[in-house]
């Protein structure tokens, strides 16, 4: 019996087609993805093959103005239109709190939404009961297939699930649910979830009875043969894991942003054993036409977005200096504003010992593309912010050793004075440079804001300590020459859309007045400094 699994993950509000790098579509003839194009391909496969499942492994929420405006209603509407068969909850589904998941998505979705390792407690338990499930048994042709869901247990640090949801260890939570499916005589089981490729592989290895793992969160691109676009494969598609009980378990993921449709064909014997699997992600490029009815629907929903982008979010009573003359040479108040917004967006008081789990932010000055003038009645709009942050990136959470941060700050000024983008703006960090020293040895003081403290204060950076830092995904991926971050990071979790983070902060503050306040100091002459 042959099953075709079509899968997406980490779509992040890319409802419209995008450019090849998943940013805003400029030249339509070269654009990719989007739900209208996805629908064309899905329907083509549904017509050609008898047993097809369309699955999503989480993180539909967050990523473009679509989510900012529609807050998840767009996800439910268009996933219903595409007739998804099941979805797993990702960490970003909790970005607007549990209410922001229940009302727009859980109550509106016509497909099951799954997670076996999220347990509700207290008053929420009855409110959310039945709206998401640990597993669902789906009829496919003459057979049944069990789908069991899972979600990153790091979600409380990455999003806003509140205090009434407990995120259990994935493997511990999945095993009893899979065992239950076995007792129900379901002998074909797919684990669908959002914990990253390493956890996907562990689930394949450790959870007895799982036949296939369809994952997300790590934006992993797998491919067999010559890849069709710029993404470099992390391994073959499917990636085959030998389980501890000796079975071959295919593991798949389909990169992100709706650029590809994962396509996996699985052959089961009469006992439900996987005896072969093959496939590849399908690049959704312009050779696949956009479905006209879905496209018309997209255009209808689009109108509200254009109106939104000119509305006032809040006011500034100071000039927001985002000029390259400032942000690539010294501390600029636009950099401070953005970093403060990044930290504010990551406030998660999950432990009495810590005022917050993260206190530090770094931001490449070259990523700040425009100032905002306060002499326009102080008004700040989404449109203004889109000029400051035009690249459609995310502000991510990484874990780094102090020694890596020190290297990053040396890189920040290794060719100072040439108006290059790598000059770092900061939050929760005080750095002093001596620019008369040779490149690679210019950081003379680097103090960081404590997290395990009731009164935050600055302490010298410790080389061997592991720190959490919020930064643009561009830097996490080694952009602007920050190869040391990419090579040495210990953990990387994708965060919220950059503009969304700043707009939310401005809306929350109502009136802003960021200052230049001595976070970054530089001098050009020899002074006697103690090294730290």
């Amino acid at each position: 019996w042959e099953l075709t699994i079509l899968h997406t993950n980490d779509v992040h509000s890319r409802l419209e087609q995008t450019s090849e790098d998943s940013s805003k579509c400029v030249n339509a003839s070269r654009c990719m993805g989007g739900v209208a194009r996805l629908f064309t391909k899905v329907q083509q496969i549904r017509r050609a093959e008898p047993n097809v499942l369309l699955l999503d492994a989480g993180d539909q929420y967050q990523g473009t103005i679509w989510f900012t405006v529609y807050k998840g209603a767009e996800v439910a509407h268009f996933m219903n239109a595409l007739r998804y068969d099941a979805m797993a909850l990702g960490n970003h589904e909790f970005d607007n709190g549990v209410e922001g998941l229940i009302e727009p998505l859980l109550k509106e979705a016509k497909f099951p939404i799954l997670s076996a390792n999220i347990k509700a407690k207290g008053p929420l338990a009855s409110q959310i009961s039945g709206l998401y499930l640990p597993y669902k048994v789906l009829p496919v042709g003459d057979e049944v297939v069990g789908i069991v869901g899972y979600t990153s247990k790091e979600t409380p640090f990455l999003s806003n699930p509140g205090t009434n949801l407990v995120f259990e260890d994935e493997i511990t939570a999945l095993q009893p649910e899979v065992d239950k499916l076995k007792t129900l005589n379901v002998n074909k089981i797919i684990a669908l979830g959002h914990s990253g490729f390493e956890m996907d592989k562990l689930i394949a290895q450790k959870v007895r009875g799982v036949d296939v793992v369809v994952g997300g969160h790590s934006n992993t691109f797998l491919y067999t043969g010559n890849p069709p676009s710029k993404e470099v494969p992390a391994g073959k598609y499917p990636f085959i894991v030998t389980s501890d009980d000796g079975r071959k378990v295919p593991v798949v993921q389909a990169y992100a942003f709706g650029k590809y449709l994962g396509y996996l064909k699985i052959e089961f014997d009469e006992r439900g054993n996987v005896i072969s699997s093959h496939g590849n992600p399908i690049l959704l490029n312009s050779s696949i036409p956009e479905d006209p009815s879905i496209k018309a629907d997209i255009n209808k929903w689009r109108i509200k977005l254009d109106n939104y982008s000119t509305q006032e979010l809040g006011k500034t009573i100071v000039y927001l200096d985002g000029s390259s003359q400032s942000c690539r040479f010294r501390e600029c108040n636009m950099g401070n504003l953005i970093c403060d917004a990044m930290i504010n967006n990551n406030l998660r008081h999950t432990d009495e010992m810590f005022w917050n789990h993260v206190s530090m932010c770094i931001l490449n000055g070259g990523g700040i593309r425009s100032p905002i003038d306060e002499r326009n009645n102080g008004t700040i709009t989404w449109e203004n912010l889109a000029a400051v942050l035009p690249f459609g990136g995310t502000f991510d959470l990484v874990q780094l050793k102090g020694s890596t941060l020190k290297k990053a700050f040396e890189h920040s000024v290794h060719r100072y004075g040439q108006s290059t983008g790598e000059f770092l703006q900061v939050g929760g960090i005080h750095v002093v440079y001596d620019l008369s020293r040779k490149p690679g040895d210019r950081v003379v003081k680097l103090d960081v804001l404590c997290t395990k403290c009731r009164v935050p204060s600055y302490d010298p950076l410790k080389m061997d300590e592991v720190y959490k830092v919020i930064l643009p995904n561009f830097l996490a991926n080694g952009g602007d020459g920050f190869q040391m971050i990419k090579d040495e990071l210990l953990r990387h979790d994708s965060g919220d859309q950059d503009i969304n983070v700043v707009s939310t902060y401005i809306s929350k503050m109502k009136v802003i007045y960021p200052a230049v306040e001595g976070r970054i100091k530089a001098h050009h002459h020899h002074h006697h400094h103690h090294h730290h």
């Epitope: 085959i240 006992r271 054993n273």
Partner: antibody
């Protein structure tokens, strides 16, 4: 094409240790499992364990746990099996094998004869 | 551990003969059975896995069948190069186990 080349025959005294190597070529070493199999003269094959060089996931047959150690050097595309506290019943040909998606022991090394004798 | 018992232990046949080797598992192994051919002084070669899937390059005269505890390897028309020892193996669960072998000799 896929090739697994094993180290040469070894003669060891009881109580000693031996380390057999298996050099892989013709494919991406970190993408496939390496299995180790023992065959005593005129006896059936016995599975010792596996190692996945991609993340060094290792699994042993309980029967061989304790005295056998599987390791891999990604940079050298080489897997190793070490047997310690050798006894006469360890005299055998030891094979490494690679899987191929849904086939377990798909490609085999030529075998390494280990003789334990005082 | 699952025991795999082959029969016969040895077998004489002529070129062109149809030959069947059976393998009995001590418990249900579904269709998770592989077959190997081994010649003296050489490493085993995979012939069949998942009961009836031929490995790359294996001639079509080799076929497998069975399910549960009883499995069979059939060689439809013996060729001179087929005289060797054949092993079955279960890949249903760890520890993987092999049969004791069937030696196929020229009559």
């Amino acid at each position: 094409q896929v090739q697994l080349v094993q180290s040469g025959a070894e003669v060891k005294k009881p109580g000693a240790s031996v380390k057999v190597s298996c050099k892989a070529s013709g494919y991406t070493f970190t993408n496939y499992y390496i299995y180790w199999v023992k065959q005593r003269p005129g006896q059936r094959l016995e599975w010792i364990g596996w190692i996945y060089p991609g993340n060094l996931n290792i699994k042993y047959n309980e029967k061989f746990k304790g005295r056998s150690t599987l390791t891999a050097d990604k940079s050298a595309s080489t897997a190793y099996m070490e047997l310690s506290s050798l006894r006469s019943e360890d005299t055998a040909v030891y094979y490494c094998a690679r899987d191929d998606n849904y086939a377990w022991f798909a490609y085999w090394g030529q075998g390494t004869l280990v003789t334990v004798s005082s | 551990d699952i025991q795999m018992t082959q029969s016969p232990s040895s077998l004489s046949a002529s070129v062109g003969d149809r030959v069947t080797i059976t393998c009995k598992a001590s418990q249900d192994v579904s269709t998770a059975v592989a077959w190997y051919q081994q010649k003296p002084g050489k490493a085993p070669k995979l012939l069949i896995y998942w009961t009836n899937t031929r490995h790359t390059g294996v001639p079509s005269r080799f076929s497998g069948s069975g399910s549960g505890t009883d499995h069979t390897l059939t060689i439809s028309s013996l060729q001179p190069e087929d005289f060797a020892t054949y092993y079955c193996q279960q890949h249903y669960s760890t520890p993987f186990t092999f049969g004791q072998g069937t030696k196929l000799e020229i009559k």
